[in-house]
Amino acid sequence: IWELKKDVYVVELDWYPDAPGEMVVLTCDTPEEDGITWTLDQSSEVLGSGKTLTIQVKEFGDAGQYTCHKGGEVLSHSLLLLHKKEDGIWSTDILKDQKEPKNKTFLRCEAKNYSGRFTCWWLTTISTDLTFSVKSSRGSSDPQGVTCGAATLSAERVRGDNKEYEYSVECQEDSACPAAEESLPIEVMVDAVHKLKYENYTSSFFIRDIIKPDPPKNLQLKPLKNSRQVEVSWEYPDTWSTPHSYFSLTFCVQVQGKSKREKKDRVFTDKTSATVICRKNASISVRAQDRYYSSSWSEWASVPCS
Amino acid sequence: RNLPVATPDPGMFPCLHHSQNLLRAVSNMLQKARQTLEFYPCTSEEIDHEDITKDKTSTVEACLPLELTKNESCLNSRETSFITNGSCLASRKTSFMMALCLSSIYEDLKMYQVEFKTMNAKLLMDPKRQIFLDQNMLAVIDELMQALNFNSETVPQKSSLEEPDFYKTKIKLCILLHAFRIRAVTIDRVMSYLNAS
């Protein structure tokens, strides 16, 4: 058993049929010695009396908020949560496996630049009785500070018969140098509680590996005289690290017909313009990627040919 | 259709082209190592990230873009002095910091070159003959060093009398390649920045 927050305790249980469970001794936080009674979850049933209460925690029915009272007055609370371990593996019932980029990916994180700011998100099908807390650091043995905000519900989607809820959090490394070469990864730890079930999830990454630039901005077409060709131009996204001559991007320009089956023409360039042939009803799209370190491509920025 | 990116014209800042080749070569070598050594801990997640140049050179600090020198977090500057002549500086008014930067890059390359050559000698003794260093990568390191053209004492190649542990050598190769790729990215950014200045 360990303390998660003030008066909130996590009981770690091996979860299998007829498991013996864990014996827990609760102590009432009071100088009083006599006339103390214990209840669970605002029930009127008295579980025991005295300054301490010993319970055998085996299942969720044994968890909850234990309260000690004296003469109708509440003295203190202890909330017991359960953390299940099945076949030596901690349960991951609360969050959905996103399976990208690999199986058992519960947390996904992205950064728009090298400023040390990043966003992580996760998915669940649970709509209520849910709370999260996020902590992060650079490295684990001698951790350096990363500050995370509160996790918020960022999207709701319908997937077949199920509703899916996306939560996200923004974090910022306290003293980040965009030009630094990372040798210690960022660690992100998410605590999740659903009803009386506790779980924790972790992710470890280098900012350089989670970079995904915003799409290029101000995408424009300039027809070339007496030609089917157009000059496409664009700019670096505002959110990208500066100076751009140091944090350079490379671009992919794509001409796509109306039908997905039509042949795509693609050109790769380090410049912020390109000359392409504009077909009728086609659209031109441009996306960006760090020129020197191949992390994710940005989403496409698009304009119609007409 | 995938159209390759055009190579920079020869009139450009002389080291940019070499640094781009360096990054390409080290990235290819790392990819090859990851594939060949698939049953070894050779991915970014599995290895310890070590920097053999730590406390010996200060490339990131010395080569910091002017715009980032206002960023407190970028300024854990370590006092290091380097010799200041080099052909990449040719026909350019350069500050002392730029000379320091380029000589720091030169020292990095020299250290990695020694490490890679020592390692290759060990790998050539491996009866499995599983992996060797790409000669192209070693040649590209050499070319960039020549383009930088700094006078510096040659570092003798490390030799070891004891029987090499090939497993450890291959893991060290992965560690070295990961670190060198990160440094090659920094070098490429620096060259691009200097070229634009």
Epitope: K5, Q42, A150, K195 | -
Partner: nanobody, 120 residues
Framework: EVQLVESGGGLVQPGGSLRLSCVAS????????MAWYRQAPGKQRELVAS???????NYQESVKGRFTISRDNAENTLYLQMNSLSPEDTAVYLC??????????????WGQGTQVTVSS
């Protein structure tokens, strides 16, 4: 901040029925238990019924068999169905919620109350 708003109170004749509702809004986090309390003039506040996170109800002896507590998780609403009401049930009925938010810790919230009067 969690807000609790009760409704459904009123004047009813002995033997009659009422259904109280309590809607929870705001960042409720993980709710560990919800309960109905009542306070009659000049008397101490007493627990009427409670329901835990697993949906297990619990009743004070005097209301067993007459009152039913339930919770609609999706709507974050607590109900109290009161049948066979007697004048002794006259009181202000208050909704209570206990929960956990991992950013702030354990909390307890009370509603303003809704008046139930049983009289002929």
């Amino acid at each position: 901040e969690v807000q609790l708003v009760e409704s459904g109170g009123g004047l009813v004749q002995p033997g009659g029925s009422l259904r109280l509702s309590c809607v929870a809004s705001g960042s409720t986090g993980s709710i560990t238990s919800m309960a109905w309390y009542r306070q009659a003039p000049g008397k101490q506040r007493e627990l009427v019924a409670s329901i835990n996170s697993g949906g297990r109800p619990n009743y004070q002896e005097s209301v067993k068999g007459r009152f039913t507590i339930s919770r609609d998780n999706a709507e974050n609403t607590l109900y109290l169905q009161m049948n066979s009401l007697s004048p002794e049930d006259t009181a202000v009925y208050l909704c209570n919620l206990r929960g956990l938010r991992l950013d702030t810790g354990l909390y307890e919230s009370w509603g303003q109350g809704t008046q139930v009067t049983v009289s002929s």
